[in-house]
Interface confidence: low
Amino acid sequence: AIVFIKQPSSQDALQGRRALLRCEVEAPGPVHVYWLLDGAPVQDTERRFAQGSSLSFAAVDRLQDSGTFQCVARDDVTGEEARSANASFNIKWIEAGPVVLKHPASEAEIQPQTQVTLRCHIDGHPRPTYQWFRDGTPLSDGQSNHTVSSKERNLTLRPAGPEHSGLYSCCAHSAFGQACSSQNFTLSIADESFARVVLAPQDVVVARYEEAMFHCQFSAQPPPSLQWLFEDETPITNRSRPPHLRRATVFANGSLLLTQVRPRNAGIYRCIGQGQRGPPIILEATLHLAEIEDMPLFEPRVFTAGSEERVTCLPPKGLPEPSVWWEHAGVRLPTHGRVYQKGHELVLANIAESDAGVYTCHAANLAGQRRQDVNITVATVPSWLKKPQDSQLEEGKPGYLDCLTQATPKPTVVWYRNQMLISEDSRFEVFKNGTLRINSVEVYDGTWYRCMSSTPAGSIEAQARVQVLEKLKFTPPPQPQQCMEFDKEATVPCSATGREKPTIKWERADGSSLPEWVTDNAGTLHFARVTRDDAGNYTCIASNGPQGQIRAHVQLTVAVFITFKVEPERTTVYQGHTALLQCEAQGDPKPLIQWKGKDRILDPTKLGPRMHIFQNGSLVIHDVAPEDSGRYTCIAGNSCNIKHTEAPLYVVDKPVPEESEGPGSPPPYKMIQT
C-alpha cells in the first residue's frame, strides 16, 4: 500500500516570495508522484515546479496559485493510486493603483458646493489600512468637511470648495507591506472671484509699419481688472502711453492694437488679469518684427542630358519662416512633371539640352522677398572640328598636332603618347584649343599620339602617328680636340645619321691627302703608328643626297703620355718631425703636379708655413701632427692625359727608449728622422 510520510499543509504565503508544499511517500514498488490544482494536473514552469515529490514555488502568484493543491502518488504496475490531504495558500499581497474620481462622473461636472468622492485603487490581502494626503499633507477623518471610508477606500468632500483644491494621493499598509498611489488626482475647484483666462494673447509677427493686435480676456465674479505692460514694465493705457508706444490703443474688450509698428515696439507684452481674490494672472505674448536675410550664392551647375539632378535652395533665415519657390524664364515651376519643385529642391528629371538656362530660387515672407539665380548648363558630348592627322615632323623644329572639338561646356583635352599621359613640360604644350605643340622634335618622338576630348556628358578620342624627319647630324659629334699617344696605334671615330644613310670621309684641314699609314675606314680615322707629323687639324665630312653635307673639325695633338719617375711611398713620421712625400712625373707636354690630401686639393698658394710643394713635385710637411695622418695623392696632368698615385702618411708618438733596447735598435717601421 502507498503511505504518505509527509502531507502538504495549508499555509500563509507572501506574494512574489518562495514557498514549498511537502509530499513524501513510501510504497512497496516504484511510484510516480504528481500534483493537482483544483483537480487539474500541475505543469512544471520556471516559477512552479516539482522538487522530488514536493512542489516548489520560486515566486508565489496570488492569481495562479489560488485554489486547492493535492499530491497524488500512483503505482503504474498495480494501478493503485493515493491522494494526499488538500492544501491551499493564504496569500498576502498589496498592489498599487491610481486615485480616481468616483463622483461626479467626470471632472467637468465638479462645481463649487457639490459633493466629490475620490477612490484609492490600492488593493491587498489582508485588507490594508488607507491614509489620504492633499499636497503631501495627511488628512485625518472627519476634519474640514471630509470623511474617509476605509472599507470602500473612499475620500468624500462635502461640499467641495476652492479650499479643497490640490493634489490628492493615498497610501495603504497591511501585514504584507505598504504601497502608495501610482497616479494622483488633481482637484481644481475654481473660486468665482479668482480671475480665469478666457482668451490668451498669441505671439505675432508683423512687417515694419504694419499693425499688430493682441487679444486678451479674463472672467471672474465680480469682473476682473485687466492691464497691459510692455517689456520695461511700463503700463499701456489710452490715457498714459509710453513715448515709444504713442500708437497703442487698448479696447474695452481687452484687445491691444499697435499701429505703424517700428523695431523699438518689438518685445514682450504682458496682459495682467486680477480678480477680487487670488493671485494675478500674467499672460505673455511677443511682438516680432518680420525679417528676411540674404540668400547664399549658387555655384553654376553642369548636368548631363538624360540624368536626374537636384538643386537645393537653402531658404534665408527669416521671421516668419520664408516660403520658397523656383522659377524658370519668369514662370513658377510646378510640383510635378519632368522639371518640378519638391520641397526646397529644384528637380530636373531626364534632362534635355533645352533645360539649360537660369533658374531662380525665390524666398519671401512678410518682410520682403529675396532671390538667387543658378546657371544650369546641360553638357553635350564633344564633336570633331579637326582630328589629329598622321604627320611628318622635322627633327629639332617645333611640331604641331591638332585636336579641335566643340561641346558645352568647353571640353577638356588631354594627350597621350604611347598610352602615357603627356604632362606639360618644357618640351610639350597643350593650347587652349587642344592643339599639342612639341617644342623641339626629337627622333624618339616618332610614335603614336592620342587625344581625348571630354565633358561631363562623355568623351571622344582619335589618334595619329608621328614620323620624325631626321636632321643630318653627327652621332655623336666628334670631340674638337683629341690627343694621340706618340708611337702608338690610334683611332678617331666619326659617325652620322640622316634621312638617308650618309657617306663619311676624313681629310686634312689644309686639303692635303692622308699619309699612307693613315687609313679612313667607314668614318674611322686609323693611325697604325703615330708620328709627330700626324698632329694637326682634320675635318670629318658627312653627306647624303637630300640633305647635303656637314663638317666637324678636329685638332689632333701628339703626346707622350704621363709616367711616374718617382712615386710617393708609405711613410711614418714622429710627431713634431718633418715628412717628405716624393713624386716626379714625365711626359710631353711636360706634366704639372698637384697634391690631394685628406680628400681636398692642396692649393700651393694657400698651404701655410708648415707645407711646401717643390719644383720637382715633392711635398714636404714640417712639424707634423696626428691630424696630418691620412692618404696623400700625387696627381700629374697635361693637356692630353692625367694620372695619379697615392700613399699613406702615419704620424706617431716618439717612443721612450726602454733599458732593454740598445741605443742603436731600429724602430719596427720605416721612419723619416730629421
Partner: antibody, heavy 119, light 113 residues
Framework: EVQLVESGGGLVQPGGSLRLSCTAS????????VIWVRQAPGKGLEWVGI???????YYANWAKGRFTISRDTSKNTVYLQMNSLRAEDTAVYFC?????????????WGQGTLVTVSS | EIVMTQSPSTLSASVGDRVIITCQAS????????LAWYQQKPGKAPKLLIY???KLASGVPSRFSGSGSGAEFTLTISSLQPDDFATYYC?????????????FGQGTKLTVL
C-alpha cells in the same frame, strides 16, 4: 506626447464615400508631409498618397481620381476623402508623418482606422 | 510603376541567429539612400527601425543595422531576440517625377524555427 489619431472609419457600401481624419497632438502638422498608407487584412503595407507642406498632393496610380487628400491647418488635421469605394478598398488606413518637409520617409504612425466596404 | 522587391518573403530562424533581409528597387532611390525599414506586429502600427538606409532610429537596439545605396539595400539583425519575430517592411522614397513618391516592399515575415 506626440501622436496621430485617425478617425472616420467604418462600414460603407460599394460605390459609397467616406472621409477619414488624421489629427495631431504635440506637433504642428503643417510643418510635415503627411502620408496615408493602408493595409488590407493579412496583406502588406500599401502607399495611398501624400500631402506636402505646400499643399501639393501625389497619389498611387490606383488611387488617382477616387481619393483626395487635404488639410485644415487651423485644426491641425489632414483628411483622406474616399469616393466610389470598392470591396478591395477594405483595409486598415494609417496616417503617418514624414521626417521633414523634404523627406517623405515615415517617422511617426497613427494607430490606424478600419474601413470595411461591403453590401 | 516602381517596384520594391523584398526577399525572402518568409524566413524561419532561431534566437541568436544572424538574419539578413534584402530590398531591391526597380530604379535608384531619391538621394540614393532614402530608404527606411519598419517592424510590424499583428494588430499594431509599424515601428521605425532604420532611416536613410543606415541610421538607427531612436530607442532601437543596436543589433539592428542597415546598409546599401542606389537600388539595393539590406537589413541585418545580428543576434535574433524573442521580441524580433514580426513582419519587416522596407519603404523607398522616389522623385515623384512619374507620380511614384513612395513604395513599400511586400514584407518579410520572420517566424520561429
Amino acid at each position: 506626447e506626440v501622436q496621430l489619431v485617425e478617425s472616420g472609419g467604418g462600414l460603407v457600401q460599394p460605390g459609397g464615400s467616406l472621409r477619414l481624419s488624421c489629427t495631431a497632438s504635440g506637433i504642428d502638422l503643417s510643418n510635415y508631409a503627411v502620408i496615408w498608407v493602408r493595409q488590407a487584412p493579412g496583406k502588406g503595407l500599401e502607399w495611398v498618397g501624400i500631402i506636402y507642406t505646400y499643399d501639393t498632393t501625389y497619389y498611387a496610380n490606383w488611387a488617382k481620381g477616387r481619393f483626395t487628400i487635404s488639410r485644415d491647418t487651423s485644426k491641425n488635421t489632414v483628411y483622406l476623402q474616399m469616393n466610389s469605394l470598392r470591396a478591395e478598398d477594405t483595409a486598415v488606413y494609417f496616417c503617418a508623418r514624414s521626417f521633414s518637409d523634404i523627406s517623405d520617409l515615415i517617422k511617426l504612425w497613427g494607430q490606424g482606422t478600419l474601413v470595411t466596404v461591403s453590401s | 510603376e516602381i517596384v520594391m522587391t523584398q526577399s525572402p518573403s518568409t524566413l524561419s530562424a532561431s534566437v541568436g541567429d544572424r538574419v539578413i533581409i534584402t530590398c531591391q528597387a526597380s530604379q535608384s532611390l531619391y538621394n540614393n539612400k532614402a530608404l527606411a525599414w519598419y517592424q510590424q506586429k499583428p494588430g499594431k502600427a509599424p515601428k521605425l527601425l532604420i532611416y536613410e538606409a543606415s541610421k538607427l532610429a531612436s530607442g532601437v537596439p543596436s543589433r539592428f543595422s542597415g546598409s546599401g545605396s542606389g537600388a539595393e539595400f539590406t537589413l541585418t539583425i545580428s543576434s535574433l531576440q524573442p521580441d524580433d519575430f514580426a513582419t519587416y517592411y522596407c519603404l523607398g522614397e522616389f522623385s515623384c517625377g512619374s507620380g511614384d513618391c513612395l513604395a513599400f516592399g511586400q514584407g518579410t515575415k520572420l517566424t520561429v524555427l
